[in-house]
Interface confidence: medium
Amino acid sequence: EAHKSEIAHRYNDLGEQHFKGLVLIAFSQYLQKCSYDEHAKLVQEVTDFAKTCVADESAANCDKSLHTLFGDKLCAIPNLRENYGELADCCTKQEPERNECFLQHKDDNPSLPPFERPEAEAMCTSFKENPTTFMGHYLHEVARRHPYFYAPELLYYAEQYNEILTQCCAEADKESCLTPKLDGVKEKALVSSVRQRMKCSSMQKFGERAFKAWAVARLSQTFPNADFAEITKLATDLTKVNKECCHGDLLECADDRAELAKYMCENQATISSKLQTCCDKPLLKKAHCLSEVEHDTMPADLPAIAADFVEDQEVCKNYAEAKDVFLGTFLYEYSRRHPDYSVSLLLRLAKKYEATLEKCCAEANPPACYGTVLAEFQPLVEEPKNLVKTNCDLYEKLGEYGFQNAILVRYTQKAPQVSTPTLVEAARNLGRVGTKCCTLPEDQRLPCVEDYLSAILNRVCLLHEKTPVSEHVTKCCSGSLVERRPCFSALTVDETYVPKEFKAETFTFHSDICTLPEKEKQIKKQTALAELVKHKPKATAEQLKTVMDDFAQFLDTCCKAADKDTCFSTEGPNLVTRCKDALA
């Protein structure tokens, strides 16, 4: 229904707290360099204006679109050109071009320092003094570093943060209560960020149809008892929600997501028997819970997929009559039977099925032609299954850090032109797949591994797009989203690469490394490993292991030495010489 004032409508629907949080996220995601105080001031102005519109929808400017209102606010910021360069040119445009322009200037890798967590005592003090400001800082800091973070989900993580602080700040040992809990939230939030970025990439590069196909597959796996019309209803609504969030329409997105959660809870009978626990929760928790609800039990009497899609005499007629619906029902029927497959794999199978029908339905004897299509799925299914087995075996043998190093070597060989920080970040993230997925039951491993890897590789592609340096990466990132992971897996050593010359300073370390937290130490060592591979792309695993073991021993020795600086300055050059010899 049309509302006289869009901003009043959203304020009323969302309530003041969520309204303010979402406006803060929106501004922080658009203008990523502004301070919290600058954004908080704008948020208060927008909220005050919204309240005047709630009181009188006919008041001046209340009928303006949200993009116009928000864009005007952003464009009124002083020193916009000095701080944001050509983003200021967006302000010369009219809506909707102005909003599109803002979206194009979102930076996936802003040059902001890592978000450092204050020590427990200080955190608790500032939280107790002003919880609202404290949570505002959290929303601002996360949103500006993750400009496509799913806004209603970020409100959920802020709520989790709040609950953890409320609980732990009342404890005697605040640190040991806070650290593991906040680490858990941080890990989940980072995964949520890369997953959502993948959804926005799908929407931006391939349009709504591609996202809707993803949603149909995913929802069919989770709700195998819902009928096709129900699944497409949910997929259509979910597509709208994600389109809005990816497009910066955060108030609409959060409002529609709440509506979708309400619809699901009111229609459990036709969707799934597993929703009740989620539906008993308050809004943010309910929507989060529904997004990761366990799969419903599959119907016992499902006929073989071949009956309708291979053996039926009217396959080509059904396909010709309504291609999208017929392919949609195929994707639905296949997905509901295979909760053990990744969405990426299901979409590859649907693509293969479509290509087969396109070819065969034009031939003299279509059934003879498409009769073997299910057998042709076999290699497509085996490839990711083998990937999971090989990588989980390796993870179990090496542990997370060792597994990350193996991936780092592999990916540096595939794309040695990529910057070392990007390679290290990618390898560390890809390596976490082991901890995240390899410990799961067998039937959950494949969807966990492949869909997570796809999301991480999407980030690699986004970073590479900014400064394209590797033809290998460009090739894999240019294709369809579902083919990316197999493409990267199939890459071998880049034979066109001219090895980097050996620079001693790259492998020179100082005693300050000793006091770094374990994670930072690992990153330093992994940076050195990537540089070694860039110097010797064809070094054997054995050679690299020798060098890295020597390096670890050197760090251990010098960090335990009484005079660390002397140890580093005398033993360091010896290490560099040994490394050169080992790789010669």
Epitope: D227, A229, N267, T329
Partner: nanobody
């Protein structure tokens, strides 16, 4: 027991319009997706359009897209099909049906109403 009763068919000239209705009883209409199917003389059944229980989304066979509109009134347990720009090839018996899980197959349908498009 499920009952579906179609009405509104008749003879119409090419380019003309008709509105079909289907009164449903014996099941919870507002939790059931519904569809219209048709059977032309001497041909097999062909699905025409599907509507979700809530009224959106809707789906159409390519042959009727842009000309036919499916809708429903859950308070009256009634399904509708508005047919515009009718063509001779739309001549068929039109059935409303309850939409189940499997593909575009359907379990319950009514007796049908005949639509004849002829000059």
């Amino acid at each position: 027991e499920v009952q579906l009763l179609e009405s509104g068919g008749g003879l119409v000239q090419p380019g003309g319009s008709l509105r079909l209705s289907c009164a449903a009883s014996g099941f919870t209409f507002d939790t059931s997706s519904m569809l219209w199917v048709r059977q032309a003389p001497g041909k097999g059944l062909e699905w025409v359009s599907v509507i979700h229980q809530s009224g959106t989304p809707t789906y159409y066979a390519d042959s009727v897209k842009g000309r036919f509109t499916i809708s429903r009134d859950n308070s009256k347990n009634t399904l509708y099909l508005q047919m515009n720009s009718l063509r001779a090839e739309d001549t068929a018996v039109y059935y409303c049906a309850k939409f189940p899980s499997r593909k575009m197959k359907f379990d319950y349908r009514g007796q049908g109403t005949l639509v004849t498009v002829s000059s």
